[in-house]
Interface confidence: medium
């Protein structure tokens, strides 16, 4: 999933079907001048940042998984 | 491209131990998580467990734990299974299977290696 | 763990014709099933993820539906090629659990 780094929407496109497991964090970036939409930008194991649909119930479900770990720690 | 190139056939006596490999080559190595997956005779298939390289993390099925021990090695690209206290009910041919970056599913997959014990 | 109840265990079917094979998950998994092929002598190949989306190379023949803990996986317009045993796979809890395989034949 194509993500770029300037001061626009960075989300070209989402990826379908992201496991938690390979999900290291998670930024949601809210509606702004850069960008009209909501987007989740997430940053895998290995590094690398993947772009998540936020309307996904299963990516909402991740993003409250990965949330109440990092205030659990 | 991606190729998992696994160790020959082994015909080990019970109570012995045994170690196959699987080289990967044509990606990052590191990067992916590797499993083990089990199939004995006449049989399906059963999720032993996995390895990331890049920082030696494990995650295993509770039937296997103690029975298999996972290891991987960077320099070379290979990851290993150590398969111990051998009985006949680990004859049975081994799978490693690369898991995507991100979703997890299983692409690729070696050819699998058959591991017979007996005395 | 989570257990995946794949049916039927065999069947067979014609050359040109559908097949469906079931899983059914013991609790939600989320869509979290793919489906394999796997052929006597060989690894097993990845052909659907994520329960509908094909894997690059695989034929639109194949597809998948579900939701839930109910799925499904069809070939139409079978080929001598597609005899194989097909295995589902859920990931969406550890430890990831197959279902028991279908072993495919053609009539």
């Known amino acids: 999933a194509s993500v770029v780094t300037e001061l626009r929407c960075q989300c070209l496109q989402t990826l379908q079907g992201i496991h938690l497991k390979n999900i290291q964090s998670v930024n949601v970036r809210s509606p702004g001048p850069h960008c009209a939409q909501t987007e989740v930008i997430a940053t895998l194991k290995n590094g690398k940042k993947a772009c998540l649909n936020p309307a996904s119930p299963m990516v909402q479900k991740i993003i409250e998984k990965i949330l109440n770990k990092g205030s659990t720690n | 491209q991606v190729q998992l190139q696994q160790s020959g056939a082994e015909l080990v006596r019970p109570g012995s131990s045994v170690k196959i490999s699987c080289k990967a080559s044509?990606?990052?190595?590191?990067?992916?998580?590797m499993n083990w997956v089990k199939q004995r005779p006449g049989q399906g298939l059963e999720w032993i467990g996995q390895?990331?390289?890049?920082?030696?993390?494990?995650n295993y099925n509770g039937k296997f734990k103690g029975k298999g021990t996972l290891t991987a090695d960077k320099s070379s690209s290979t990851a290993y299974m150590q398969l111990n206290s051998l009985t006949s009910e680990d004859s049975a041919v081994y799978f490693c299977?690369?898991?995507?970056?991100?979703?997890?599913?299983?692409?690729?997959w070696g050819q699998g290696t058959s591991v017979t014990v007996s005395s | 763990d989570i257990q995946m109840t794949q049916s039927p265990s065999s069947l067979s079917a014609s050359l040109g014709g559908k097949v469906t094979i079931t899983c059914k998950a013991s609790?939600?998994?989320?869509?979290?099933i793919a489906w394999f092929q796997h052929k006597p002598g060989k690894g097993p190949r990845l052909v659907i993820h994520?329960?509908?989306i094909l894997q690059p190379g695989i034929p639109s023949r194949f597809s998948g539906v579900g939701s839930g803990r109910d799925y499904s996986f069809s070939i139409r317009n079978l080929e001598p090629e597609d005899i194989a045993t097909y295995y589902c796979?859920?990931?969406?809890?550890?430890?990831?659990?197959f279902g028991g395989g279908t072993k495919l034949e053609i009539k």
């Open positions: 299977a690369r898991e995507r970056d991100y979703d997890v599913a299983m692409d690729y």
């Open positions: 044509g990606y990052a190595f590191s990067d992916y998580w």
């Open positions: 390895i990331y390289p890049g920082d030696g993390d494990t």
């Open positions: 609790q939600d998994i989320n869509k979290y």
């Open positions: 994520y329960t509908s």
């Open positions: 796979l859920q990931y969406d809890n550890l430890p990831w659990t």
